[in-house]
Interface confidence: medium
């Protein structure tokens, strides 16, 4: 007979056979014959395939190494890798999470457009006009400057973008 | 109901000749492999060779023990099985079976077995 | 070749008894094995094949199990049309290779 050239779909070509590819979850320990079929075995513990495959080793589950601030977001399963992410306060360095970083603080005339997560940083915009921020800080929004108005005081100094305005009393001899 | 009916043993010089058949019925035959085993008188059982089904082109395999001697075909049209034996050996006296393979998923193995003919191989 | 290992060429049984036959093979067949009973008369029929599964038809107090290089065959409660001559047979590589039988009689 005419030997196969292509294979259904979790099947692969080996020695003119289709042979059936092992399970997520599963790697290879030997190929089908024409009597028997593909053998497969379950990856150990700490291991993963999360594809169906014809691998002869399973890969190790990802470690989420705490001296670079990771820790483990969720555990790995026979069929899915580990995934890392970082400890409070600090964030991924790339997707693939293999380091981190301290979430960085907006300077003062900047405020919290976005706080840090476990995957990306920290987002600072520029404090517009009538906003301020005197702090550097990775979790403050810039403030509204005070309505020296509402308080019935008048504006003593003029705020900037890294200070709020200063209130004082109405003067009283201006007619 | 599958069956398998063995027929053509009997007695042969050393040296000489002899055909087997082996009518199948109750299946499609032309879908499974088909095989001859032996067991000589007294003894285990041995398996001589095979031949394919229609979708592997109807190939054959043998034992080592019958090589060259011994020849696997099929009458698809009537669903029969032949065993032709030829440069006999006192050795080869026995009872020979013809029977069905079954599939691959589990290993192959002979789910169904004629009643056997016997052949003797004598001066 | 691979060579079928039967150690117990006859065993003797009451019936109702649980009887165990077993089988070795000379390297691991990866559980491609199979039983096959052969009555006096000479009939051979498949009991079990892929080492526990059985063929349609036959009793379920035939089991069947093992791994690796070594099998067993079990029938939990002897009954006397059980009497027969047993076989096991390896599907891993050609060429497929029998064991030598093991003859169940009765006490």
């Known amino acids: 007979p005419e030997p196969p050239t292509a294979c259904r779909e979790k099947q692969y070509l080996i020695n003119s056979q289709c042979c059936s590819l092992c399970q997520p979850g599963q790697k290879l320990v030997s190929d089908c014959t024409e009597f028997t079929e593909t053998e497969c075995l379950p990856c150990g513990e700490s291991e993963f395939l999360d594809t169906w495959n014809r691998e002869t080793h399973c890969h190790q589950h990802k470690y989420c190494d705490p001296n670079l601030g990771l820790r483990v977001q969720q555990k790995g399963t026979s069929e899915t890798d580990t995934i890392c992410t970082c400890e409070e306060g600090w964030h991924c360095t790339s997707e693939a999470c293999e380091s981190c970083v301290l979430h960085r603080s907006c300077s003062p005339g900047f405020g919290v457009k976005q706080i840090a997560t476990g995957v990306s940083d920290t987002i600072c915009e520029p404090c517009p006009v009538g906003f301020f921020s005197n702090v550097s800080s990775a979790f403050e929004k810039c403030h509204p400057w005070t309505s020296c108005e509402t308080k019935d005081l008048v504006v003593q100094q003029a705020g900037t973008n890294k200070t709020d305005v200063v209130c004082g009393p109405q003067d009283r001899l201006r007619a | 109901e599958v069956k398998l009916v063995e027929s053509g043993g009997g007695l042969v010089q050393p040296g000489g000749s002899l055909s087997l058949s082996c009518a199948a019925s109750g299946f499609t035959f032309t879908d499974y492999y088909m095989s001859w085993v032996r067991q000589p008188p007294g003894k285990a059982l041995e398996w001589l060779g095979f031949i394919r089904n229609k979708p592997n082109g109807y190939t054959t395999e043998y034992s080592a023990s019958v090589k060259g001697r011994f020849t696997i075909s099929r009458d698809n049209s009537q669903s029969i099985l032949y065993l032709q034996m030829n440069a006999l050996r006192a050795e080869d006296s026995a009872t020979y079976y013809c029977?069905?393979?079954?599939?691959?998923?589990?290993?192959?193995?002979?789910?169904?077995w004629g009643q056997g003919t016997t052949l003797t191989v004598s001066s | 070749d691979i060579q079928m290992t039967q150690t117990t060429s006859s065993l003797s049984a009451s019936l109702g008894d649980r009887v165990t036959i077993s089988c070795r093979a000379s390297?691991?067949?990866?559980?491609?094995l199979n039983w096959y009973q052969q009555k006096p008369d000479g009939t051979v029929k498949l009991l079990i094949y892929y080492t526990s599964r059985l063929h349609s038809g036959v009793p379920s107090r035939f089991s069947g199990s093992g791994s690796g290089t070594d099998y067993s065959l079990t029938i939990s409660n002897l009954e006397q049309e059980d009497i027969a001559t047993y076989f096991c047979?390896?599907?891993?590589?050609?060429?497929?290779?029998f064991g030598g039988g093991t003859k169940l009689e009765i006490k």
């Open positions: 029977a069905r393979y079954g599939g691959k998923l589990t290993g192959f193995y002979f789910d169904y």
């Open positions: 390297q691991d067949i990866r559980k491609y």
């Open positions: 047979q390896q599907g891993n590589t050609l060429p497929w290779t």
